[in-house]
Every structure is written in structure tokens, then in C-alpha cells.
Interface confidence: medium
């Protein structure tokens, strides 16, 4: 934008100076626009190119034209013009920066009469000594209570002079305050020193709850002592309820170990659960940690007195940004075993995870992994792939966290890392995994199962094999046979029974000679190709008293296929009414090449089984 020819500042005349000021409003962009005006609507300041030539009345300028001004220009204006500008800014609700407010206040040297017409926050920068009479000070401080005191940092001279002046104005002597005094002080009550907190806890603590900034050391100690003393309004911590915790929300960070330990544990847990589910009660929190920490986290200083010396329960009351700023990652790593005992919210666990990620970018050491506890639920499979987990105790500790849930991708990755790290699926590992995930074994491929040593089979329970398919049982059965080979008949059958879905015909024939009384459920899981060659007599011996169950299963494999291969005469000897066998006088010729090649008979497919009616010779009939 081209700058027009400069004109002299005429001070009391005001017009040329004002024109210059208004032009610079936009060109220097020195002010933060009101959120309602520009910040959120995307509006920008209007250019002021024509203002110098035709300076309008200040009050006729639009909010967009009042977005900024430099202090140097204000210093050239008359007090009257400064007041006019201040009033216009208030009317248009233009939000000014601290520097601009300070600048305006400095130029309003005489105490303004029309306090109500000025921007509320401007009053914070006026000298309270200028309003010394009882009426003047009352009017001044009544307005101040509505201003945003936190525009000024605690140490700012303007803020420091307000509290003593306010106390004097309201006639407060000593440190004892009434409810009306606290109300009259407004935001300045947050600056009251610890002695006031100690003597006026009943009326002051509920006000301190909503103070936006952290309390100073002196205030914290006084608040802690008052709360621990168990006086009104909150009573002894041992009697606190969830609603007490809600009411105390802003003071929770100052609670020490003794107080936290004396609150009923169930109350703390219930409150944490509720507040993490429904955070509507919380004060708006500075969004310092960006979502999921995907970008660099803004570094914010830890408030004084909040630096964590150890990982303990007091941290549950820290906001996310305070955890980030006040908890040292190395301290966290050495005291990970304590984290699981503390009811952190998932949001807080995110912060702790981020700290560990920064400390160990290549992956956590196993001494930390073993103590992750619920923080494990925050890990991604990508995080876990960086780990080297070889201790079964570590695996067990992490599986415990996920207990009762389906196997998550995280758990699957963890198990995979563990098994690869150990080099084999040994008995203790299998014992652990199947205890947590009965279906674990059946989730492995036949190739993975081949690395299971026979000794590990002792850890397998029948329910662990419920979801295994025949290909998996084909791999596991020979291992089980080897593992149980030294057991006697009945004990051997009990152990081998759940693996029999992988057994060949010859083993089934051998079992039929041992009076094992196989139940129908086991029989129905046998390989069809292993059952087909069994004779009726062998099946009868194999099933014992359970043979009667064949009738109910005659339409299902492998019973259906087996019946079709048996002579009807033989089936009739069972007395079960099984139908579908080969009638007398029929000859079965199995011409299937497929069975010879693959070992899988295709008895009822198109063509492979040829049933030939043999004509009985007349001479034989004769």
C-alpha cells in the first residue's frame, strides 16, 4: 500500500493527527482483532486510503477500521481525542493488546468521569490512586471486578498495585474476609496472599477454585493446609464425594499426598472416570498439546512448585500441558512401575507416552516395557515392532492389561515379536498365551506351528484346539503323539483325544483295539480320509457305547461318507437302522485316480466311483 504525503501532527487541533492515526490503524496491523469481529469470521481490516483527505468522526468508523493503532500516533493526540478513541473502541467491542491498553491509559492522565463508557480492560491500566475518594474508588473497583485481570501477569506493576488499593477501598482490615468482600474483589481475589487463605478459607477457597492461573507457592501451601484441616466448606477429605471433587476442580492440583490418600479410593476412581468421560465441567484449558503429538509440542514452562519429584497420585490432577512441562521423561522411565497404580485418564496417558517416545525414539527398553501397564493400550503396532521383548514376565504383564478382550493388533504384534525373539514357541510361552487366549494356537499357520517343540504340547488344553482346522491338527498331532508316547492306554487317550483331528487311519485302527470309547464329538472331527477305510467292526470298537450316536449323524460328514463305503449287511449288524450302504449283490469298483494321487477319496463325485451290478450266474442261483 502506498503511503500518502505525511502531514504535521497538530496536537490540540486533532484532525491531521487523527487522519494519520486512522491510516496507520490498518497499515501497521498492531492490534489483535476481537474474536467476534475478525478472528473467527475471517474478516480483515478495511483499507483506509481515503481517510487522510477526509477525516471522519471516530465513532463513525467501522470495527474493521478500528483494528489497530501504534502508540506513537496516540501520543500526539489530545486527551479529548484519546478519550473519544477509547469510547469508540469500547462501543465497537474491539479487543486491544496489553501494549495498546497501557498506551491509552497513559494518555488518559486525568481520572475519566465516564468510566462505564471506556473499554473494561482499560481500567486495569489506570492508576487506582486517581480514584481515592470513597465514591470514586467504589465506582472504579465495581467496574474492575468485571475486567479480565489475567490480561496482566501476576508480577506486572499495574496488577500488583490493584489489590492493596481494592482492599483499602472496601475497608478490609487484617486477613479476615466476608463473602461480600470476596465478591467485591472479583478476579483480584485470586491474588490474595496465603494469610487470607488461611484465615478466610470458608469464603475464599470456593473462589480460588475458579482462578485461571496457577496459585503461587504461598497460596498453595495455605490452601493445602486448609483442605487437610477438614474445615468448612468441604470438610475432611475422608468424607469427600464425587460432587466435592467437582466443586474443588481448580484446587485439585495443589492437593498433596496425605490429602489424596485420605480421599476414599472409590471416590477418586469414580470421579476420574466421570471427568474423563464428561469433561464439560472443566475450565477451558490452554490447548498447548496438539492432537496426538504429531507435531512438535509447544514448550511451556512448568508453573512454580509443580515440578514432579516422583511419579505419584498428585499427578492425576495435573492438566495435560502441566504433565508435559513438569514431568521429566527419565524420572517417568525409572518409575514406570508406579504409573499403573495411578488412575490417569487416557488423555494423560497420551502425554506420558509422548514423553517416553521422545526419550526412546528407537523403541523402549524392556525394563520400561515390563511396567507399561495400561499405557500398553496406547501403543500402536508400529511402536511395538521397535521393541525387543524376550521376558515371559513382560509378556504376561502386558497380556494381563488386555485380559478379557479380543486379541488386538497390538497384542498380536507383541506375541509375534516375543516368539521371534525367543526363537521358538516353548512350553512356558504356550502355557501363558493359551491361558490368555485359548484360541491362540489355532491362529498360527501350519508353518508357525511347526516350530512348536513336542514338549510344549503338554501345555495345550482341549479348548485351545476348538477352532483349529485339519491342516493345523495335521501338524500338531504328530507332536502330541511324540509328547504322550510314554503314557499308558487310557491316560494316553485322554491327552491325545483333542489332537485326533490330525490322526491317520492306522492310528485310529490301533486305538480301536484299546477300548477307548471315543465320544461322537471327537469322531465327527476326525479326518474324513482317515475314517473311510475303517470297517464297521473297527468303528464299533472305537466308539464303544457311543456308537448309537451314529444314527443322529448319518447325514453329516464323515459319518455320511463312511456309511456309503460300508456294506449294508455290515451296517445292519449295528442295529441302528443306518441306511445308504452298498446293497448285497453290488460290487464297488473304485476307479478314482484322484484318490491315488492325492490321498483324498472322491467317492460321490461325478464318475469316480462305479457301482457295477454283478449278474449272478444261473448256476450259482441254482
Amino acid at each position: 500500500m502506498a503511503l500518502p504525503t505525511a502531514r504535521p501532527l497538530l496536537g490540540s487541533c486533532g484532525t491531521p493527527a487523527l487522519g494519520s492515526l486512522l491510516f496507520l490503524l490498518f497499515s501497521l496491523g498492531w492490534v489483535q482483532p476481537s474474536r467476534t469481529l475478525a478472528g473467527e469470521t475471517g474478516q480483515e481490516a478495511a483499507p483506509l486510503d481515503g481517510v487522510l483527505a477526509n477525516p471522519p468522526n471516530i465513532s463513525s468508523l467501522s470495527p474493521r477500521q478500528l483494528l489497530g493503532f501504534p502508540c506513537a500516533e496516540v501520543s500526539g493526540l489530545s486527551t479529548e481525542r484519546v478519550r473519544e478513541l477509547a469510547v469508540a473502541l469500547a462501543q465497537k467491542n474491539v479487543k486491544l493488546s496489553t501494549e495498546q491498553l497501557r498506551c491509552l491509559a497513559h494518555r488518559l492522565s486525568e481520572p475519566p468521569e465516564d468510566l462505564d463508557a471506556l473499554p473494561l480492560d482499560l481500567l486495569l491500566f489506570l492508576n487506582p490512586d486517581a480514584f481515592s475518594g470513597p465514591q470514586a474508588c467504589t465506582r472504579f473497583f465495581s467496574r474492575i471486578t468485571k475486567a479480565n485481570v489475567d490480561l496482566l501477569p501476576r508480577g506486572a506493576p499495574e496488577r500488583q498495585r490493584l489489590l492493596p488499593a481494592a482492599l483499602a477501598c472496601w475497608g478490609v482490615r487484617g486477613s479476615l474476609l466476608s463473602e461480600a468482600d470476596v465478591r467485591a474483589l472479583g478476579g483480584l481475589a485470586c491474588d490474595l496472599p496465603g494469610r487470607f487463605v488461611a484465615e478466610s478459607a470458608e469464603v475464599l477457597l470456593p473462589r480460588l477454585v475458579s482462578c485461571p492461573g496457577p496459585l503461587d507457592q504461598d497460596q498453595q501451601e495455605a490452601a493445602r493446609a486448609a483442605l487437610q484441616g477438614g474445615g468448612p466448606p468441604y470438610g475432611p477429605p475422608s468424607t469427600w464425594s464425587v460432587s466435592t471433587m467437582d466443586a474443588l476442580r481448580g484446587l485439585l492440583p495443589v492437593l498433596g499426598q496425605p490429602i489424596i490418600r485420605s480421599i476414599p479410593q472409590g471416590i477418586v476412581a469414580a470421579w476420574r472416570q466421570r471427568s474423563s468421560r464428561d469433561p464439560s465441567w472443566r475450565q477451558p484449558e490452554r490447548t498447548i498439546l496438539r492432537p496426538r503429538f504429531r507435531r512438535e509440542v509447544e514448550k511451556t514452562a512448568c508453573p512454580s512448585g509443580k515440578k514432579a519429584r516422583e511419579i505419584d497420585e498428585s499427578l492425576i490432577f495435573y492438566k495435560k500441558w502441566e504433565l508435559e512441562a513438569c514431568v521429566d521423561a527419565a524420572l517417568l522411565a525409572t518409575q514406570m512401575d508406579r504409573v499403573n497404580a495411578i488412575p490417569f485418564t487416557y488423555e494423560q496417558l497420551d502425554v506420558l507416552k509422548h514423553k517416553l517416545d521422545e526419550l526412546y525414539p528407537q523403541g523402549y527398553p524392556e525394563s520400561v516395557i515390563q511396567h507399561l501397564g495400561y499405557l500398553f493400550l496406547k501403543m500402536s503396532p508400529e511402536d511395538i515392532r521397535k521393541w525387543n521383548v524376550t521376558s515371559l514376565e513382560t509378556l504376561k504383564a502386558l497380556l494381563e492389561v488386555n485380559k478379557g478382550h479380543e486379541m488386538s493388533p497390538q497384542v498380536a504384534t507383541l506375541i509375534d515379536r516375543f516368539v521371534k525373539g525367543r526363537g521358538q514357541l516353548d512350553k512356558d510361552t504356550l502355557d501363558t498365551l493359551t491361558a490368555f487366549y485359548p484360541g491362540y494356537l489355532c491362529s498360527l499357520s501350519p508353518e508357525e506351528l511347526s516350530s512348536v517343540p513336542p514338549s510344549s504340547i503338554w501345555a495345550v488344553r482341549p479348548q485351545d484346539l476348538d477352532t483349529c482346522d485339519p491342516r493345523q491338527l495335521d501338524v500338531l498331532y504328530p507332536k502330541a503323539r511324540l509328547a504322550f508316547q510314554n503314557m499308558n492306554g487310557s491316560e494316553y487317550f485322554v491327552k491325545i483325544q483333542s489332537f485326533l483331528g490330525g490322526a491317520p487311519t492306522e492310528d485310529l485302527k490301533a486305538l480301536s483295539q484299546q477300548n477307548v470309547s471315543m465320544d461322537l464329538a471327537t469322531f465327527m472331527k476326525l479326518r474324513t480320509d482317515a475314517v473311510l477305510p475303517l470297517t464297521v467292526a473297527e468303528v464299533q470298537k472305537l466308539l464303544g457305547p457311543h456308537v448309537e450316536g451314529l444314527k443322529a449323524e448319518e447325514r453329516h460328514r464323515p459319518v455320511r461318507d463312511w456309511i456309503l463305503r460300508q456294506r449294508q449287511d455290515d451296517l445292519d449288524t449295528l442295529g441302528l437302522g443306518l441306511q445308504g450302504g452298498i446293497p448285497n449283490g453290488y460290487l464297488v469298483l473304485d476307479l478314482s485316480m484322484q484318490e491315488a494321487l492325492s490321498g483324498t477319496p472322491c467317492l460321490l463325485g461325478p464318475g469316480p466311483v462305479l457301482t457295477v451290478l454283478a449278474l449272478l450266474l444261473a448256476s450259482t442261483l441254482a
Epitope: P365, E366, Q370, N388, S391, E393, K396, G421, G423
Partner: nanobody, 123 residues
Framework: QVQLVESGGGLVQPGGSLRLSCAAS????????MGWARQVPGQGLEWVSG???????YYADSVKGRFTISRDNAKNTVYLQMNSLKPEDTAVYYC?????????????????WGQGTQVTVSS
């Protein structure tokens, strides 16, 4: 067959030092965490220290700063250097695979265990 053989125990005066060794065989040593636990007669097992396959370590609070665990993968051996011994360190010390810690159940520890070596601290 996993075998763990401890050595180095004995009688020592308070303030003295001992170095326990545990020779391991029958498994891929470098792939396993190793640890030391101890048992006072009539009491349960207490994990003292552990060293994982990645070399990271932990110690029970009662021995932090006094005991140091280390491993030599080439020799399939894990060591426990015990300094500033106290009478309350008197116990049978066991070498074990799959070290746990105070947060894991000790009544039914996993892994394999050695026969133990007696450490007595007394004046």
C-alpha cells in the same frame, strides 16, 4: 534341557561384598532375560534384579545403588555384584530366566530356576 548353576555365595560381614555367578545352558542365552531372586526361610520369593536381552536392568528398591547385575552373552553367564551387604540381605539367591519384578506374581514364577546359593551376612 535348561540348566542354571549358581555360585559365589557364602558368609560375609556387614558392609562386605560378594559376586554371584549363574552359568546357563540348554537354551539361546542371548534371547532371554535373566534375573536374580532371593528367598528368606519362611517367606516368599522376592525379585532382586533383572537384566533383559537388550541389556536394560531393574533393581528392587531395597538393593538399588548397592547391587549391580550384568551379563556376558559370550559366556552364557549372568552376574550379581553385591556391595555394602546388610544382615537383611541374608537369603538363598536363585538365578532364573524371565525376570519379573515387584509388579508380577512371585508365588508362581515362570521360567527356569537354579538350585540356589546361600548368602549369609553376619558379624
Amino acid at each position: 534341557q535348561v540348566q542354571l548353576v549358581e555360585s559365589g555365595g557364602g558368609l560375609v560381614q556387614p558392609g562386605g561384598s560378594l559376586r554371584l555367578s549363574c552359568a546357563a545352558s540348554g537354551f539361546t542365552f542371548r534371547n532371554y532375560g535373566m534375573g536374580w531372586a532371593r528367598q528368606v526361610p519362611g517367606q516368599g520369593l522376592e525379585w532382586v534384579s533383572g537384566i533383559f536381552s537388550d541389556g536394560s536392568t531393574y533393581y528392587a528398591d531395597s538393593v538399588k545403588g548397592r547391587f549391580t547385575i550384568s551379563r556376558d552373552n559370550a559366556k552364557n553367564t549372568v552376574y550379581l555384584q553385591m556391595n555394602s551387604l546388610k544382615p537383611e540381605d541374608t537369603a538363598v539367591y536363585y538365578c532364573a530366566t524371565d525376570p519379573g519384578s515387584g509388579t508380577t506374581t512371585l508365588h508362581r514364577p515362570f521360567g527356569s530356576w537354579g538350585q540356589g546359593t546361600q548368602v549369609t551376612v553376619s558379624s
